[in-house]
Interface confidence: low
């Protein structure tokens, strides 16, 4: 299953399959997740080691048993791949690293006014993988405000150095934020020229394209079909690049298919997994296990659940079957692709779905309609779980926020439905940033069921929580995916990086905002909060957040939206915007429903009819 915990001051011994330099443990974890054989990783921050060569070292590891011995190493951080972790799987990495220079091939330099602009330039350059920016206080005047766009053979820095007044980061192309745009066309009977960066076997051009999209240096590809004239090249997928970023030439060639990486697509990227099953095809590879199962779909599920399994073949040969069950061959290889693909067999083959965003495990297991004051504009995909709950009566208007917690589930505040419990008047917009972008043609979700907490009472602040079941499940994208729920009764975690988002009023007597607003707000202890609200009981099922001096807060229209906190590189839904005395007033923190206290209720209500929970909190 999905294991998200990080081990501090621990290093996994042995099992190495690859190593690289990464700026932090989270990026190292992401590289592990996308590496076909990596199950575990260990990262050495600069502070943890004197050996300059090993500083920022990211060590990717595999283990037959799924675990390795841990040794104590001060400062080291270790953890698990996020394979099988559903929507948490993403190649998108937005962080900016201050005081760090990520080295690579510098292929472009320009003067810019901010690190954000530098990151944007990298994101809009087809070859840029990461960048470094020298700030205005950099010690050498001639380098100040320089934005260096970089790449490397593996897509990660060739070295990372601690350097004052330098800021580094990665391209946001994997966040589907590139302005370049992409070519969706597949070109039949056409072969591209240029440099081959890798060669893998795939059953079709679509798998080849997805592998190209997630390969650090692939910009385009050519696939040789299973009827290609040279037998040894059949089903070969050649991943390619060029100096210009586009093929320098193409040749008409029977039984070849070519196309482009989809990494530069805006607003949508393909999932990093392959769900199709190929009848009459055998995938060869190293045998992991053989098991008797009923049907090819169960075979694929079995492969997906066995974390080391990369692909499978389900045999229908009479000697491989007994009664209704047949042999399911679970396999793996060095590069995650079959070592042999055979056609015209009595088997069916396919891939593990461990890197799919959309599995069952897709969620990590006010007194007045309140309230973002003192916030700033959000950017695309920054808060992909945020939804807008709108009511369509004569006119249509935004009333509340909400958080996507599963394909078919939104969590919000119960008081949003005070006086409006009719499900057919509500429209739920997900994957949006600007309310003004909503037109009559914008797709929205309708409500199948509103589940208000049984102990909620109108005009009281207690149990201000409600679940919305959508009529149809949503697909996950970089702009529309769920937020992890906390563990039940999560009281030990100290959250220091918390944000509230919403389209609510920007001042107490204001109006709904067009662009989704965000504000960084510290949590306040319940004892401190209680002192500020003598009239109301601040229960253990509430959490408060705000600045003593006020000035930043949620406000009218933000109700039901998320209070999220980042811990160990993972965002969690800590609170639901509920109520407060006015907005952003001095010594009047916002009060939020504490989600951890309602985990039993959430899991009970979201149980599917077959008794399997549709969401789970992180391990």
């Amino acid at each position: 299953g999905c294991l998200t915990q990080l081990y501090e001051n621990a290093f996994f011994r042995g099992g190495d399959v690859a190593s690289m330099y990464t700026p932090n443990a989270q990026y190292c974890q992401m590289r592990c997740t996308f590496h076909p054989r990596c199950l575990l990783f260990s990262f050495l921050p600069a502070s943890s080691i004197n050996d300059m060569e090993k500083r920022f070292g990211c060590f990717l590891k595999d283990s037959v048993t799924g675990t390795l011995p841990k040794v104590h190493r001060t400062g080291a951080v270790s953890g698990h791949s996020l394979k099988q972790c559903g929507h948490q799987i993403s190649a998108c990495h937005r962080d900016i690293y201050k005081g760090v220079d990520m080295r690579g091939v510098n292929f472009n330099v320009s003067k810019v006014s901010s690190v954000e602009e530098c990151q944007k330039r990298c994101t809009s350059n087809i070859r840029c993988q990461f960048f470094s920016y020298a700030t205005q206080t950099f010690h050498k005047a001639e380098y100040r405000n320089n934005c260096l766009l970089k790449y490397s053979p593996g897509g990660t820095p060739t070295a990372i150095k601690v350097l004052s007044n330098v800021e580094s980061g990665f391209s946001l192309k994997p966040c589907a934020l590139s302005e370049i745009g992409c070519h969706m066309n597949i070109f039949q009977h056409l072969a591209f020229s240029d440099v081959d960066v890798a060669r893998v076997l795939t059953p079709d051009a679509f798998v080849c394209r997805t592998i190209c999209t997630y390969h650090p240096n692939c910009l385009f590809f050519t696939f040789y079909t299973n009827v290609w004239k040279i037998e040894s090249q059949r089903n070969v997928c050649l991943l390619k690049t060029s100096e210009s970023g586009t093929p320098s030439s193409s040749t008409p060639q029977e039984n070849t298919i070519s196309g482009y990486s989809l990494l530069t697509c805006k607003r949508t990227l393909p999932e990093p997994c392959h769900s199709k099953i190929y009848p009459g095809v055998d995938f060869g590879g190293e045998e992991l296990n053989v098991t008797f199962v009923k049907g090819v779909n169960v075979c694929q599920e079995t492969c997906t659940k066995m974390i080391r399994c990369q692909f499978f073949t389900y045999s229908l040969l009479p000697e491989d079957c007994k009664e209704e069950k047949c042999k399911c061959f679970l396999r793996l290889s060095m590069d995650g692709s079959p070592t042999r693909i055979a056609y015209g067999t009595q088997g069916s083959s396919g891939y593990s779905l461990r890197l799919c965003n959309t599995g069952d495990n897709s969620v990590c297991t006010t007194k007045t309609s309140t309230r973002i004051v003192g916030g700033t504009n959000s950017s695309w995909g920054e808060w992909p779980w945020q939804v807008s709950l709108q009511v369509k009566l004569t006119a249509q208007r935004h009333l509340c926020g909400g958080s996507l917690i599963g394909h078919q589930w939104v969590l919000t505040a119960a008081h949003c439905f005070d006086g409006l419990p009719l499900q057919d008047v509500w429209r739920i917009y997900s994957g949006i940033l600007n309310l003004s972008d909503i037109t009559k043609d914008t797709p929205f979700s309708q409500i199948k069921e509103i589940i208000i907490h049984q102990n909620y009472k109108v005009s009281e602040g207690n149990h201000d929580i409600a679940l919305i079941k959508l009529q149809a499940p949503l697909n996950y994208t970089e702009f529309q995916k769920p937020i992890c729920l906390p563990s039940k009764g999560d009281t030990s975690t100290i959250y220091t990086n918390c944000w509230v988002t919403g389209w609510g009023f920007s001042k107490e007597k204001g109006e709904i905002q067009n662009i989704l607003q965000k504000v960084n707000i510290p949590l306040v202890t319940n004892e401190e909060c209680q002192k500020r609200y003598q009239d109301y009981k601040i229960t253990q099922r509430m959490v408060c957040a705000g600045y003593k001096e006020g000035g930043k807060d949620a406000c009218k229209g933000d109700s039901g939206g998320p209070l999220v906190c980042k811990h160990n590189g993972m965002w969690r839904l800590v609170g639901i915007t509920s109520w407060g005395e006015g907005c952003a007033r001095r010594e009047q923190p916002g009060v939020y429903t504490k989600v951890a206290e309602y985990m039993d209720w959430i899991l009970e209500k979201t149980q599917s009819s077959d008794g399997k929970a549709q969401m789970q909190s992180p391990a």
Partner: antibody, heavy 118, light 107 residues
């Protein structure tokens, strides 16, 4: 000395009305939520109603909802309970209490008796 | 509404005895539980708040414990002035509710 003193109890016929008062002294009345609790003869305690310190939020037990109204006058340091449509089952000793979320009902009055009988 | 069930309804004890009264809530009340003492003809008096915190001025022979749904009031050494009726009360969610009371009598 922190003190609460109820008044206004008495005998009333079913369907009648009564207004109870509770005078507070010895503490900053306007800073505390207040509540009413009653006790029928030979029975246990029953929570009746609560009002926030400013008077902006009121809560009632289902048994009295729509018939009783809690209010306060912070300038007079006084809490009130207006009781309408009284029934025999409303017969009880009515206590007013300071209702601090943090420490419960920490200050009580001596009680005033309400008898509803024909 | 949350139901509060006290047990026993009454008990007979001697001076010096250790007495325990339990209170069970129909759902978790997260330690939002208070204990009161009431003597005949008098107003109730707060003894314990938040399940285990001793109210100012209350002797330390009274103690409270518990979490979730189950709570206990203990009188370590019963004295003549402790013979009274004891009530638990939840303030987890409105309406506040009291237990039916436990009458502690002289054996």
């Amino acid at each position: 000395e922190v003190q609460l003193l109820e008044s206004g109890g008495g005998l009333v016929q079913p369907g009648g009305s009564l207004r109870l008062s509770c005078a507070a002294s010895g503490f900053t009345f306007s800073s505390y939520p207040m509540g009413w609790v009653r006790q029928a003869p030979g029975k246990g305690l029953e929570w009746v109603s609560r009002i926030s310190s400013s008077g902006g939020m009121t809560i009632y037990a289902d048994s009295v909802k729509g018939r009783f109204t809690i209010s306060r006058d912070n300038s007079k340091n006084t809490l009130y309970l207006q009781m309408n449509s009284l029934r025999a089952e409303d017969t009880a000793v009515y206590y007013c209490a300071r209702d601090d979320w943090n420490v419960g009902m920490d200050v009580w009055g001596q009680g005033t008796t309400v008898t509803v009988s024909s | 509404d949350i139901q509060m069930t006290q047990s026993p309804s009454s008990l007979s004890a001697s001076v010096g005895d250790r007495v325990t009264i339990t209170c069970r809530a129909s759902q978790s009340i997260s330690s939002y539980l208070n204990w009161y003492q009431q003597k005949p003809g008098k107003a109730p008096k707060l003894l314990i708040y938040a399940a285990s915190s001793l109210q100012s001025g209350v002797p330390s022979k009274f103690s409270g414990s518990g979490s979730g749904t189950d709570y206990t009031l203990t009188i370590s050494s019963l004295q003549p002035e402790d013979f009274a009726t004891y009530y638990c009360q939840q303030t987890y969610t409105t309406p506040w509710t009291f237990g039916q009371g436990t009458k502690v009598e002289i054996k």
